[in-house]
Protein backbone atom coordinates (compact mmCIF):
# COMPACT_ATOMS: atom_id res chain seq x y z
CA UNK A 1 0.00 0.00 0.00
CA UNK A 2 1.27 3.47 -0.84
CA UNK A 3 1.89 5.90 1.95
CA UNK A 4 0.09 9.21 1.73
CA UNK A 5 0.88 12.88 1.68
CA UNK A 6 0.14 14.80 4.85
CA UNK A 7 -1.15 18.29 5.41
CA UNK A 8 0.54 18.66 8.80
CA UNK A 9 4.15 19.80 9.39
CA UNK A 10 7.04 17.38 8.95
CA UNK A 11 7.81 17.10 12.66
CA UNK A 12 5.19 14.38 12.95
CA UNK A 13 6.65 12.21 10.25
CA UNK A 14 8.68 10.08 12.64
CA UNK A 15 6.44 10.13 15.69
CA UNK A 16 4.57 7.23 17.31
CA UNK A 17 1.03 6.55 18.48
CA UNK A 18 1.80 7.93 21.94
CA UNK A 19 2.14 11.51 20.72
CA UNK A 20 -0.07 13.62 22.96
CA UNK A 21 -2.89 15.59 21.39
CA UNK A 22 -2.02 19.00 22.76
CA UNK A 23 -5.14 20.57 21.28
CA UNK A 24 -7.24 18.91 23.96
CA UNK A 25 -7.02 19.22 27.76
CA UNK A 26 -4.70 16.65 29.29
CA UNK A 27 -5.17 15.50 32.87
CA UNK A 28 -2.28 13.24 33.85
CA UNK A 29 -2.13 14.32 37.50
CA UNK A 30 -4.32 16.59 39.55
CA UNK A 31 -3.39 19.50 37.31
CA UNK A 32 -4.93 20.03 33.91
CA UNK A 33 -2.79 21.38 31.10
CA UNK A 34 -4.75 23.45 28.63
CA UNK A 35 -2.86 24.53 25.55
CA UNK A 36 -4.22 27.75 24.05
CA UNK A 37 -5.16 27.85 20.37
Amino acid sequence: MDSFNYTTPDYGHYDDKDTLDLNTPVDKTSNTLRVPD
Epitope: G12, H13, Y14, D16, K17, D18, T19, L20, D21, T24
Partner: antibody
Protein backbone atom coordinates in the same frame (compact mmCIF):
# COMPACT_ATOMS: atom_id res chain seq x y z
CA UNK B 1 6.57 2.03 -3.66
CA UNK B 2 6.18 1.96 0.10
CA UNK B 3 5.45 -1.63 1.07
CA UNK B 4 5.28 -4.04 4.01
CA UNK B 5 5.18 -7.78 3.37
CA UNK B 6 4.57 -10.27 6.19
CA UNK B 7 5.65 -13.90 6.10
CA UNK B 8 6.09 -16.87 8.44
CA UNK B 9 2.48 -17.66 9.22
CA UNK B 10 1.12 -21.19 9.24
CA UNK B 11 -0.33 -23.98 11.33
CA UNK B 12 1.19 -24.61 14.77
CA UNK B 13 0.14 -26.71 17.73
CA UNK B 14 -0.83 -25.17 21.08
CA UNK B 15 2.29 -24.50 23.11
CA UNK B 16 4.37 -24.17 19.97
CA UNK B 17 6.39 -21.28 18.58
CA UNK B 18 6.46 -19.27 15.38
CA UNK B 19 8.40 -16.28 14.11
CA UNK B 20 6.77 -13.80 11.78
CA UNK B 21 8.74 -11.42 9.58
CA UNK B 22 7.74 -8.12 8.02
CA UNK B 23 9.93 -6.94 5.15
CA UNK B 24 9.86 -3.19 4.51
CA UNK B 25 10.74 -1.44 1.29
CA UNK B 26 10.40 1.98 -0.29
CA UNK B 27 11.12 4.02 2.84
CA UNK B 28 13.73 4.57 5.55
CA UNK B 29 12.64 1.72 7.80
CA UNK B 30 15.02 2.61 10.64
CA UNK B 31 13.31 5.97 11.20
CA UNK B 32 9.86 4.61 11.98
CA UNK B 33 8.10 3.04 14.93
CA UNK B 34 6.57 -0.29 13.89
CA UNK B 35 3.60 -2.15 15.35
CA UNK B 36 1.94 -5.55 15.07
CA UNK B 37 -1.87 -5.77 14.93
CA UNK B 38 -3.91 -8.97 14.66
CA UNK B 39 -7.42 -9.92 13.65
CA UNK B 40 -9.06 -13.18 14.68
CA UNK B 41 -11.40 -14.70 12.07
CA UNK B 42 -14.60 -12.65 11.90
CA UNK B 43 -13.45 -10.36 14.72
CA UNK B 44 -12.11 -6.83 15.10
CA UNK B 45 -8.61 -5.40 15.13
CA UNK B 46 -6.48 -6.10 18.20
CA UNK B 47 -3.16 -4.45 18.98
CA UNK B 48 -0.27 -6.80 19.73
CA UNK B 49 2.70 -4.55 20.41
CA UNK B 50 5.25 -2.11 19.07
CA UNK B 51 8.91 -1.27 18.79
CA UNK B 52 10.08 2.30 18.56
CA UNK B 53 12.86 3.41 16.24
CA UNK B 54 16.38 3.54 17.62
CA UNK B 55 16.13 7.34 17.59
CA UNK B 56 13.03 7.04 19.78
CA UNK B 57 14.85 4.68 22.14
CA UNK B 58 14.05 1.35 20.51
CA UNK B 59 11.74 0.38 23.36
CA UNK B 60 8.97 -2.21 23.12
CA UNK B 61 5.46 -2.37 24.55
CA UNK B 62 3.02 -5.26 24.47
CA UNK B 63 -0.67 -5.94 24.94
CA UNK B 64 -1.45 -7.69 28.23
CA UNK B 65 -2.61 -10.88 26.54
CA UNK B 66 0.75 -11.49 24.81
CA UNK B 67 3.20 -10.02 27.32
CA UNK B 68 5.83 -12.56 28.33
CA UNK B 69 5.01 -14.81 25.37
CA UNK B 70 5.63 -12.56 22.35
CA UNK B 71 8.77 -10.59 21.53
CA UNK B 72 9.09 -7.85 18.93
CA UNK B 73 12.46 -7.03 17.41
CA UNK B 74 13.83 -5.26 14.37
CA UNK B 75 16.89 -5.51 12.15
CA UNK B 76 17.34 -2.11 10.54
CA UNK B 77 20.19 -3.42 8.38
CA UNK B 78 17.73 -5.86 6.79
CA UNK B 79 14.72 -3.54 6.86
CA UNK B 80 12.82 -6.25 8.68
CA UNK B 81 10.50 -6.38 11.68
CA UNK B 82 9.99 -9.61 13.63
CA UNK B 83 7.39 -11.10 15.95
CA UNK B 84 8.58 -14.10 17.95
CA UNK B 85 5.56 -15.95 19.33
CA UNK B 86 6.04 -18.57 22.04
CA UNK B 87 3.61 -20.64 24.15
CA UNK B 88 0.95 -20.17 21.50
CA UNK B 89 -2.71 -20.62 22.42
CA UNK B 90 -5.73 -21.38 20.25
CA UNK B 91 -6.93 -17.83 20.89
CA UNK B 92 -3.81 -16.51 19.14
CA UNK B 93 -5.27 -17.71 15.83
CA UNK B 94 -5.53 -14.61 13.65
CA UNK B 95 -4.27 -12.71 10.66
CA UNK B 96 -1.21 -10.75 11.82
CA UNK B 97 -0.46 -7.38 10.26
CA UNK B 98 2.62 -5.21 10.62
CA UNK B 99 2.02 -1.48 10.38
CA UNK B 100 4.12 1.65 10.15
CA UNK B 101 3.37 4.75 12.21
CA UNK B 102 3.57 8.26 10.83
CA UNK B 103 1.72 11.32 12.07
CA UNK B 104 0.28 9.30 14.94
CA UNK B 105 -1.51 6.82 12.70
CA UNK B 106 -0.96 3.44 11.05
CA UNK B 107 -0.41 4.79 7.56
CA UNK B 108 1.06 1.69 5.92
CA UNK B 109 -0.12 -1.88 6.52
CA UNK B 110 1.11 -5.20 5.25
CA UNK B 111 -1.20 -7.68 3.57
CA UNK B 112 -1.26 -9.89 6.66
CA UNK B 113 -0.19 -13.45 7.38
CA UNK B 114 -2.48 -16.09 8.88
CA UNK B 115 -1.44 -17.92 12.04
CA UNK B 116 -3.55 -20.93 13.00
CA UNK B 117 -3.03 -22.53 16.40
CA UNK B 118 -4.73 -25.91 16.51
CA UNK B 119 -4.04 -29.46 17.61
CA UNK C 1 -14.48 -6.17 25.10
CA UNK C 2 -12.86 -3.23 23.36
CA UNK C 3 -11.57 -0.20 25.26
CA UNK C 4 -13.16 2.13 22.71
CA UNK C 5 -16.89 1.71 22.13
CA UNK C 6 -18.45 1.80 18.67
CA UNK C 7 -21.93 0.78 17.51
CA UNK C 8 -21.78 -2.72 15.96
CA UNK C 9 -23.63 -1.59 12.84
CA UNK C 10 -25.01 1.44 11.02
CA UNK C 11 -26.85 1.68 7.73
CA UNK C 12 -28.00 4.26 5.25
CA UNK C 13 -29.33 4.65 1.75
CA UNK C 14 -27.15 5.87 -1.12
CA UNK C 15 -26.65 9.62 -0.93
CA UNK C 16 -27.46 9.81 2.77
CA UNK C 17 -25.20 10.89 5.63
CA UNK C 18 -24.19 8.49 8.39
CA UNK C 19 -22.07 8.96 11.49
CA UNK C 20 -20.13 6.42 13.53
CA UNK C 21 -19.36 7.25 17.14
CA UNK C 22 -16.35 6.18 19.19
CA UNK C 23 -16.40 6.60 22.95
CA UNK C 24 -13.35 6.38 25.17
CA UNK C 25 -11.97 8.00 28.30
CA UNK C 26 -9.55 10.67 29.48
CA UNK C 27 -6.70 8.14 29.37
CA UNK C 28 -7.04 7.53 25.64
CA UNK C 29 -9.19 9.70 23.35
CA UNK C 30 -9.12 12.52 25.90
CA UNK C 31 -5.33 12.70 25.68
CA UNK C 32 -4.22 11.25 22.36
CA UNK C 33 -5.04 11.50 18.68
CA UNK C 34 -7.80 9.46 17.06
CA UNK C 35 -7.56 7.65 13.73
CA UNK C 36 -10.23 5.98 11.63
CA UNK C 37 -9.71 3.01 9.32
CA UNK C 38 -11.81 1.40 6.63
CA UNK C 39 -11.51 -2.35 6.06
CA UNK C 40 -13.05 -3.93 3.01
CA UNK C 41 -13.66 -7.70 3.14
CA UNK C 42 -10.45 -9.72 2.83
CA UNK C 43 -8.15 -6.70 2.78
CA UNK C 44 -5.90 -4.84 5.22
CA UNK C 45 -7.26 -1.73 6.94
CA UNK C 46 -6.75 1.63 5.24
CA UNK C 47 -6.48 4.94 7.09
CA UNK C 48 -9.30 7.40 6.40
CA UNK C 49 -8.71 9.99 9.12
CA UNK C 50 -5.59 10.71 11.17
CA UNK C 51 -4.96 13.15 13.99
CA UNK C 52 -8.68 13.47 14.72
CA UNK C 53 -9.74 15.27 11.56
CA UNK C 54 -6.97 15.13 8.97
CA UNK C 55 -7.66 13.33 5.71
CA UNK C 56 -4.87 11.66 3.69
CA UNK C 57 -4.64 12.59 0.04
CA UNK C 58 -6.73 10.23 -2.02
CA UNK C 59 -9.46 9.91 0.60
CA UNK C 60 -12.66 11.60 -0.62
CA UNK C 61 -13.84 14.66 1.28
CA UNK C 62 -17.10 12.80 1.90
CA UNK C 63 -15.24 11.36 4.91
CA UNK C 64 -14.64 13.65 7.89
CA UNK C 65 -13.59 13.15 11.49
CA UNK C 66 -14.09 15.09 14.68
CA UNK C 67 -13.21 14.77 18.33
CA UNK C 68 -14.69 16.32 21.45
CA UNK C 69 -13.51 15.44 24.93
CA UNK C 70 -13.41 11.68 25.27
CA UNK C 71 -15.42 10.88 22.15
CA UNK C 72 -14.83 10.97 18.42
CA UNK C 73 -16.97 10.49 15.35
CA UNK C 74 -16.63 9.67 11.68
CA UNK C 75 -19.11 11.18 9.24
CA UNK C 76 -19.71 9.90 5.74
CA UNK C 77 -21.82 12.04 3.40
CA UNK C 78 -23.18 11.13 -0.01
CA UNK C 79 -23.09 7.45 0.88
CA UNK C 80 -22.00 5.16 -1.93
CA UNK C 81 -22.24 1.40 -2.40
CA UNK C 82 -18.45 1.07 -2.22
CA UNK C 83 -18.48 2.54 1.29
CA UNK C 84 -19.92 -0.73 2.60
CA UNK C 85 -17.16 -1.98 4.89
CA UNK C 86 -16.02 -2.25 8.50
CA UNK C 87 -14.83 0.95 10.21
CA UNK C 88 -12.53 1.13 13.24
CA UNK C 89 -11.50 3.98 15.50
CA UNK C 90 -8.14 3.90 17.19
CA UNK C 91 -6.11 5.78 19.80
CA UNK C 92 -3.33 5.37 22.32
CA UNK C 93 -3.81 4.88 26.06
CA UNK C 94 -1.83 6.07 29.08
CA UNK C 95 -1.25 2.42 30.03
CA UNK C 96 1.23 2.17 27.13
CA UNK C 97 -0.99 0.35 24.71
CA UNK C 98 -2.85 1.03 21.51
CA UNK C 99 -6.61 0.72 21.68
CA UNK C 100 -9.13 0.00 18.91
CA UNK C 101 -12.87 0.24 18.81
CA UNK C 102 -14.76 -2.99 18.27
CA UNK C 103 -15.57 -2.00 14.71
CA UNK C 104 -18.75 -0.86 12.97
CA UNK C 105 -20.24 -2.61 9.97
CA UNK C 106 -21.67 -0.09 7.51
CA UNK C 107 -24.44 -1.38 5.28
CA UNK C 108 -25.52 0.64 2.26
CA UNK C 109 -29.20 -0.07 1.69
CA UNK C 110 -30.91 -0.71 -1.62
Amino acid sequence: EVQLVESGGGLVKPGGSLRLSCAASGFTFSSYAMHWVRQAPGKGLEWVGRIKSKAQGGTTDYAAHVKGRFTISRDDSKNTLYLQMNSLKTEDTAVYYCARVSFSTFDVWGQGTLVTVSS
Amino acid sequence: QSVLTQPPSVSGAPGQRVTISCSGSSSNIGSYYVSWYQQLPGTAPKVLIYRNNQRPSGVPDRFSGSKSGTSASLAITGLQAEDEADYYCDSWDHSSMNVFGGGTKLTVLG
